[in-house]
Structures are given as C-alpha cells and as structure tokens.
C-alpha cells in the first residue's frame, strides 16, 4: 500500500509560517496552507479548539476569526458539512452581536440570530447554517486576512 | 527536509494591495492553495464530461499530489472526480499523462468501476458514467 509523500515538514493544518508563494503576482499572497479566494486569505482548521483558543490562534497569525461579509463569502466550500467557529460574540455593553472589529451583525446574515443564546458563541457552516454553542465546545475554526 | 522553498518574515505577513478583485494567476472565482489554482465545481458530470470541462478551462481534472492536499480537498468537498482512470480492471490505474498511479484506490476489484474519485480522505473507484462533482486544477 502506497501513501502519499509528505511535501512539507510543517504539521498539517495549523496556521504556518509566513510564506510568499506568488512572488511575481500583484495579487493574493497567502501564507502556505492558507486559501486565497476573492482577495481574502482563509485558514481552514482541521483541529478542534474552543472559541477563545481559536481567536488567539488567528490573532497569532495577524488574522482574525472569520467575519462574514455575506453568506456567499465561503461559496468555494459550500459543500462542507463541518461547523466552524467565527468571530461573532455577544456584547452585553452594546446588547448586540458584534464581530471582532466591533461592527454589528447584519440581521440579514442569520435570520434566526434573535434566538441565539447570548452566552454562547457562533459556529457556522459554509452552506449558510449557524448554531449558537457553548464557547467551551471544541470546533474547527476559520481565520481570515483581508488583502484589500 | 522540506521540498518547499520557504521564505520567512516574522515581522509582517507577505501581503500586497491588490488591483483586481481576484488573484492574478488564477481565474476569477477560482481558489489558490499551495501554489495551485482550483476550480471548485458545483455541477455534477460524468468523468469524461468533467475531463472536457476542465480542458475547456485550460486546466486539468483534479490531481492529488500528497496527503495534505487530499485532506484539504476533503474539507472543501466530500467527493469529486480525479484525473485517474483505467481501461479495464485488467489494466493499471494511470494518470492523465499516462503514468502509472501507485496509490491505493478502494474497490479496484470491481470491473465496472474504472474511474477514480476522491471521497473524504481516500481514493475510490467509481463508474465512469456516474454524475459526480468535479474540480479542476492548474499548477502555478
């Protein structure tokens, strides 16, 4: 039985070192093991972490937990059936669901957001589903870097 | 030792402002990953139709170069055709450039299943006439 030869000594699917792959391009230069799509870079984890751990892991890569612009943003992985932590949390101070950059959640993004438990964090499936779950649960996560 | 040429810059990420809304080396709406462009199809096609569809996009039907790429693609999509086939169960599995494909393909003993599909972290044989999602790849 043959198995594939590993091409990299980096452990699979942890945000890796800063590597420029498209050296001659004036466009997306995403780190190794990150996905470039529509001028954003995404790290799609295969490891499960709590929401806080996920947030810190993204921050350590100068990125943030996914902030969605619209439900089509992850169109390239809409067939995925995993749920991923995203950068949405409830602010008691503002009595609103806020993204990590402080902007408010659009009511059109998740029509059911009013039923979310405000003590929970939000796990998102790229098909458009969102669930509120205990922030101590371990889920995969998605980091995002905006290039423009 | 890694076969990748790695350039480290600990102080800042290697990013540049972009002029276009898509990546220069890849067609719009394709994704980049590890120095390749991928078209992530939503449409289901037979193996041969998928082959032609990728050719028309100046690319190849998905090829899998290593375990890590297989894991990544399995996260993106549960199953898709790959560019590996055989003429019959008595013939070897070959890639699109005619090279023998050495990696394990499940259910190879079934004579009706002569095209290969990636299915959640493993490679399987399937009926070439089945309608399955396809992805295309273009190495940068």
């Amino acid at each position: 039985k043959n198995s594939f030869t590993k091409l990299s000594i980096e452990p699979a699917f942890t945000p890796g070192p800063n590597i420029e792959l498209q050296k001659d391009s004036d466009c997306c230069s995403c780190q190794e093991k990150w996905v470039g799509y529509r001028c954003n870079c995404y790290f799609i984890s295969s490891e499960q972490k709590t929401w806080n751990e996920s947030r810190h892991l993204c921050a350590s890569q100068k990125s943030s937990l996914l902030q969605l612009q619209n439900t089509d943003e992850l169109d390239f992985m809409s067939s995925s059936q995993q749920f991923y932590w995203i950068g949405l949390s409830y602010s008691e101070e503002h009595t609103a669901w806020l993204w990590e950059n402080g902007s408010a959640l659009s009511q059109y993004l998740f029509p059911s957001f009013e039923t979310f438990n405000t003590k929970n964090c939000i796990a998102y499936n790229p098909n458009g589903n969102a669930l509120d779950e205990s922030c101590e649960d371990k889920n995969r996560y998605i980091c995002k870097q905006q290039l423009i | 030792p890694s076969t990748l040429i790695q350039r480290h810059n600990n102080s800042s990420l290697n990013t540049r402002t972009q002029k276009a809304r898509h990546c220069g080396h890849c067609p719009e709406e394709w994704i980049t990953y590890s120095n390749s462009c991928y078209y992530i199809g939503k449409e289901r096609r037979t193996w041969e139709e998928s082959l032609l569809a990728c050719t028309s996009k100046n690319s190849s039907l998905l090829s899998i170069d290593n375990e890590e790429e297989m894991k990544f693609l399995s996260i993106i999509s549960p199953s898709s055709w790959i560019g590996v086939f055989r003429n019959s169960s008595h013939h070897p599995w070959v890639t699109m450039n005619g090279l023998a494909f050495k990696h394990e393909i499940k259910d190879s003993d079934n004579a009706e299943l002569n095209c290969a599909v990636l299915q959640v972290n493993r490679l399987k044989s399937a009926q070439c006439g089945s309608s399955i999602i396809y992805h295309c790849k273009h190495k940068l």
Partner: antibody, heavy 120, light 107 residues
Framework: EVQLVESGGGLVQPGGSLRLSCAAS????????MNWVRQAPGKGLEWVST????????YYADSVKGRFTISRDNSKDTLYLQMNSLRAEDTAVYYC?????????????WGQGTLVTVSS | DIQMTQSPSSVSASVGDRVTITCRAS??????LAWYQQKSGKAPKLLIY???SLQIGVPSRFSGSGSGTDFTLTISSLQPEDFATYYC?????????FGQGTKLEIK
C-alpha cells in the same frame, strides 16, 4: 475498535425515572458529539438528543424536552440519559450513537441498545 | 421539522437484482443525508453519508445519490445479507429526522 455499550434499561412505571449509561471505548471520546436514538417496538428510528464534545451544548427532540437530560463525563468516557416523568410512549430500545468525524449529524457507530419499558 | 418520506415502504427482490429506494425531504437539505441498514434485533449500520459518500467498510454495491429534496439509495446487485430495513436520515438541522423505513424482503 470502537465500542459503545448501553446499560440502565428496564421496567419502570409511568411517571418514574431511569438513567441510561453508555460506556465508550476505541476512540477519543472527548472529540466527538454523542447522541441517543430510540426505536419503539416494531417502529422506526427516532432521534432523541445530542450533546456536544465538551458537554456544553445539548439538543432535544420536542417529545422529550423538559423530561430528559443528556450529559457526559469525558473523564470516564461515558454518556448518560436521565429520563424523568416517563410515559408509555417512551417505551423503546435506546441506542447511543457516536457522531461521524465528517459531520456531526451522522451516526457512524451504535451501541447494541438497551430496552426501556414504561408500564404499570 | 423536516419530514422524511421513503418509498416504497417494502420491496421484494431476488439475489442479484438491482434495487432502488427513494427518500424525499419536505424541504431542501442540500446533501445532508445518510442511509442506514438495520437487521432484525440489531443496531442500525451507517451505509452512506453526505448523500453519496460510502462509509468505510461498506461494499461498493451500495451507492447514494441526490441533492436538495430527492435522494436515492441503490444496491447494484443484491446479496443474501442485504435483506434488511433501510432508513434515510436528514442531518441538515435539528431535530434530526428519519424516514419511516423500507423493508427489503426476499422474493
């Protein structure tokens, strides 16, 4: 080899309580959501409850909400179902089932089941 | 809640036959569908997940297809051990729901 072994079933009167257990082995229990699914005699399958990997999030079928409580002890690799205010219609074989690694809504391994009979 | 309707409720077939069972969801569930096989007095066994992905260890004569609301389980050439009851299940949203089952009997 993945194994799930249920216990705690038996005969109980309407209004009574019962606690089911499911001992897991052969996989990293704390990494997976777990489920209870039941099957009334001669009937089809009915999902009962799901608990997340850490135990922090739980989901219930409307038919058992407020009466049943799912929980887990990751240090003991054990899943529980506390059943209160039991009714005749809760009579069934109760299966514990592990969530699939690809997506948590699929059940890739099942226990052999434990029979709960609610009757006076 | 999403209702799952299987047809037929029972089917008689012979060894070597090709058998198709269908499952319809009351609303679109993309590809969030599983098929299970259950033999009398035994626990269910996962055959197919994500509508068409074959669970490891399941023979390739079993295949699944469909997306949205209409799904199919096909057994290409029936074997004696395939006579059982088959259930579909949606995993798109809570509460997870099963079809009523299709009993596959020997003709």
């Amino acid at each position: 080899e993945v194994q799930l072994v249920e216990s705690g079933g038996g005969l109980v009167q309407p209004g009574g309580s019962l606690r089911l257990s499911c001992a897991a082995s052969g996989f990293t229990f704390s990494s997976y959501a777990m489920n209870w699914v039941r099957q009334a005699p001669g009937k089809g399958l009915e999902w009962v409850s799901t608990i997340s990997n850490s135990g922090g999030t739980t989901y219930y079928a409307d038919s058992v909400k407020g009466r049943f409580t799912i929980s887990r002890d990751n240090s003991k690799d054990t899943l529980y179902l506390q059943m209160n205010s039991l009714r005749a219609e809760d009579t069934a074989v109760y299966y514990c089932a592990k969530a699939h690694y690809y997506a948590r809504g699929y059940f890739d391994y099942w226990g052999q089941g434990t029979l709960v009979t609610v009757s006076s | 809640d999403i209702q799952m309707t299987q047809s037929p409720s029972s089917v008689s077939a012979s060894v070597g036959d090709r058998v198709t069972i269908t499952c319809r969801a009351s609303q679109g569930i993309s590809s969030w569908l599983a098929w299970y096989q259950q033999k009398s007095g035994k626990a269910p066994k996962l055959l197919i997940y994500a509508a068409s992905s074959l669970q490891i260890g399941v023979p390739s004569r079993f295949s699944g297809s469909g997306s949205g609301t209409d799904f199919t389980l096909t057994i290409s050439s029936l074997q004696p051990e395939d006579f059982a009851t088959y259930y579909c299940q949606q995993a798109n949203s809570f509460p997870y729901t099963f079809g009523q089952g299709t009993k596959l009997e020997i003709k």
